[in-house]
Interface confidence: low
């Protein structure tokens, strides 16, 4: 339905509070370096303009597209050239090229200071003094650090953030109440950001068809009682929502997400029996709940897949008539029967099936040619099953920290050209798969583990894309979305790598390490481990373990010493010498 004024339409649909919050998120995700106050000023100007359009949709400029209005506003920032360099060139372009240009300049790893959490009393005072500014600042800081964060979901996080302060700032022990809630929001927020980043990468790098295939598989697992036509409708709508959010169209995205939640709840009888509780919640909670809802029970007595997709004489006819529809039905039927498979495995099976039909439907005897297609699935299913079994055994044997270290060594040897901070971040996250998924029963392990690994490896891919240093990473990241994990798993030690020069400075530590949290101390040690492997890629597990054990003992000893700094200086030299000897550096 066409509206005379798009900005008035969205303002009325979303309400002033959500409109302002979403415009702030959009602006912060585009101009990640701009000060908070500048963004607030721009948002207020846009909001006042929107109100004039609500009052009179025929008013001047009210008929302009949101991209035109927002882009014009962003291009008024005086310091654009000095702060953003070539991004300022976007302003010379016309829509839609200008928006595409802004999108291309989004930075997954912006050079911003780490967010330091103030004392609880300081935060509570700031919250009480000006609640609105306090919450806007939260949206701004998250959005600028996570330029692809799913905007309607960030509104849900902000709502929880506000609730945490409202409750805890009047509690007897404010810190005991607030800090665990903030930790939970931080961890969930990072996970949510990474999951959305994969959706955007899927759409932007591999196209709508790839995203739709992912959505068909996931929604069919989640809603196995829904008809194919129903799943297709949900997939189309969901694709529109994510295309909009990934494209910076946050007002449209939030509006359409609300419509989709409404549709799902109005039609839950034909979608899933698990939606009742979700649908009783307010909008933001409802949408979040639906997105996380557990899989419905599979319908009883589903017929064998082979009848329609292998034994039928009409396979090639049906495939030729509407390829994507037929493959979509295959994926739907396979996924609804297999909640125990990862989405990426289901997509690999569908791709194998498609390749077989492409080949066989042109053969002299198509049926004879594709009769054994399901046999080709067996090794594809067994590969992730075996990998998860082996890695869960290793995780249970080592615990999370040492399991992360094993992965750090493994991945540094595979792609030693990648920056140390990226290797540490990615390997730490890969290692979290253990505590996240290995506790699950067999039937839930693979969807948990492999789909989580897809999210983490996408982090590696987007960080690497900013400054490409390894052909192997580029190859695994770009060749096939669903085969990224098998591609990285298959990489062996990079024999072409020239070891890094030894630099004693890299292994020089100071007393400040003693005041770090356990997590930060682990990161310091893991950074040293990556650097060791980069110096000595052929070092054995035993050699590396010995050096790391010595290192841990050294840190512990010096942190207990009276003169910590002297201890770190003197014992540090001895440790470097001993490590060089142990590794033959």
């Amino acid at each position: 339905d066409a509206h005379k004024s798009e900005v008035a339409h969205r303002f009325k649909d979303l309400g002033e509070e959500n409109f302002k919050a979403l415009v702030l998120i959009a602006f912060a995700q585009y101009l990640q370096q701009c000060p908070f106050e500048d963004h607030v000023k721009l948002v207020n100007e846009v909001t006042e303009f929107a109100k004039t359009c609500v009052a009179d949709e025929s008013a001047e400029n009210c008929d302009k597209s949101l991209h035109t209005l927002f882009g014009d506003k962003l291009c008024t920032v005086a310091t654009l050239r000095e702060t953003y360099g070539e991004m300022a060139d976007c302003c010379a372009k016309q829509e839609p090229e200008r928006n595409e240009c802004f999108l291309q300049h989004k930075d997954d790893n912006p050079n911003l200071p780490r967010l330091v959490r103030p004392e609880v009393d300081v935060m509570c005072t700031a919250f009480h003094d000006n609640e609105e500014t306090f919450l806007k600042k939260y949206l701004y800081e998250i959005a600028r650090r996570h330029p692809y964060f799913y905007a309607p979901e960030l509104l849900f996080f902000a709502k929880r953030y506000k609730a945490a302060f409202t409750e805890c700032c009047q509690a007897a022990d404010k810190a005991a109440c607030l800090l665990p809630k903030l930790d939970e929001l931080r961890d969930e927020g990072k996970a949510s950001s990474a999951k959305q980043r994969l959706k955007c990468a899927s759409l932007q790098k591999f196209g709508e068809r790839a995203f739709k295939a992912w959505a068909v598989a996931r929604l069919s697992q989640r809603f196995p009682k829904a008809e194919f036509a129903e799943v297709s409708k949900l997939v189309t709508d969901l694709t529109k929502v994510h295309t909009e959010c990934c494209h910076g169209d946050l007002l449209e995205c939030a509006d359409d997400r609300a419509d989709l939640a409404k549709y799902i709840c109005e039609n839950q009888d034909s979608i899933s029996s698990k939606l009742k509780e979700c649908c009783e919640k307010p909008l933001l909670e409802k949408s979040h709940c639906i997105a996380e809802v557990e899989n419905d029970e599979m319908p009883a007595d589903l017929p064998s897949l082979a009848a329609d997709f292998v034994e039928s004489k009409d396979v090639c006819k049906n495939y030729a008539e509407a390829k994507d529809v037929f493959l979509g039905m295959f994926l739907y039927e396979y996924a609804r029967r297999h909640p125990d498979y990862s989405v990426v495995l289901l997509l690999r099976l569908a791709k194998t099936y498609e390749t077989t039909l492409e080949k066989c439907c042109a053969a002299a005897d198509p049926h004879e040619c594709y009769a054994k297609v399901f046999d080709e699935f067996k090794p594809l299913v067994e590969e992730p099953q075996n990998l998860i079994k082996q890695n869960c055994e290793l995780f249970e044997q080592l615990g999370e920290y040492k399991f992360q270290n094993a992965l750090l060594v493994r991945y540094t040897k595979k792609v030693p050209q990648v920056s140390t901070p990226t290797l540490v971040e990615v390997s730490r996250n890969l290692g979290k798969v253990g505590s996240k998924c290995c506790k699950h029963p067999e039937a839930k392990r693979m969807p948990c583990a492999e789909d989580y690994l897809s999210v983490v490896l996408n982090q590696l891919c987007v960080l690497h894309e900013k400054t490409p240093v390894s052909d192997r990473v580029t190859k695994c990241c770009t060749e096939s979305l669903v085969n990224r994990r098998p591609c990285f798993s298959a990489l062996e030690v990079d024999e072409t790598y020239v070891p890094k020069e030894f630099n004693a400075e890299t292994f020089t530590f100071h007393a400040d390490i003693c005041t770090l949290s356990e997590k930060e101390r682990q990161i310091k040690k893991q950074t040293a481990l990556v650097e060791l492997v980069k110096h000595k890629p052929k070092a054995t597990k035993e050699q590396l373990k010995a050096v790391m054990d010595d290192f841990a003992a050294f840190v512990e000893k010096c942190c207990k010493a009276d003169d910590k700094e002297t201890c770190f200086a003197e014992e540090g030299k001895k440790l470097v010498a001993a490590s060089q000897a142990a590794l033959g550096l």
Epitope: G207, E208, R209, K212, A229, S232, K233, T236, T239, K240, T243, A320, E321, A322, K323, D324, V325, G328, E358
Partner: nanobody, 117 residues
């Protein structure tokens, strides 16, 4: 049976315009995204443009951005491609497909577009 019948092609001079149509039947047209794909002699298929099921989302190949416009009329079960400022390199067989496939979805033969002076 799924049927996609393309029409509207022809011979046109550089800078000229054509409007291609694709009449669809045998499936619920309004439920599926659609694409226009072209194949030039001795070249692989190239997706020119795609449109979402309700017509709200569109995608264009860089080579045709600003010159081609995809649209659809779900009431008439018809997909369109308006081609302006045509160039010799737009010469190809154009066919429509269901979803975003670059392989023909039905038995349609496509429609030949030739841009030449």
């Amino acid at each position: 049976q799924v049927q996609l019948v393309e029409s509207g092609g022809g011979l046109v001079q550089p800078g000229g315009s054509l409007r291609l149509s694709c009449a669809a039947s045998g499936f619920t047209f309004g439920q599926f995204g659609m694409s226009w794909v072209r194949q030039a002699p001795a070249k692989g298929p190239e997706r020119v443009s795609a449109i979402s099921s309700d017509g709200s989302g569109t995608i264009y190949a860089d080579s045709v951005k600003g010159r081609f416009t995809i649209s659809r009329d779900n009431a008439k079960n018809t997909l369109y491609l308006q081609m302006n400022s045509l160039k010799p390199e737009d010469t190809a067989v154009y066919y429509c497909t269901i979803g975003s496939s670059t392989t023909p979805s039905g038995p349609g033969q496509g429609t030949q577009v030739t841009v030449s002076s």
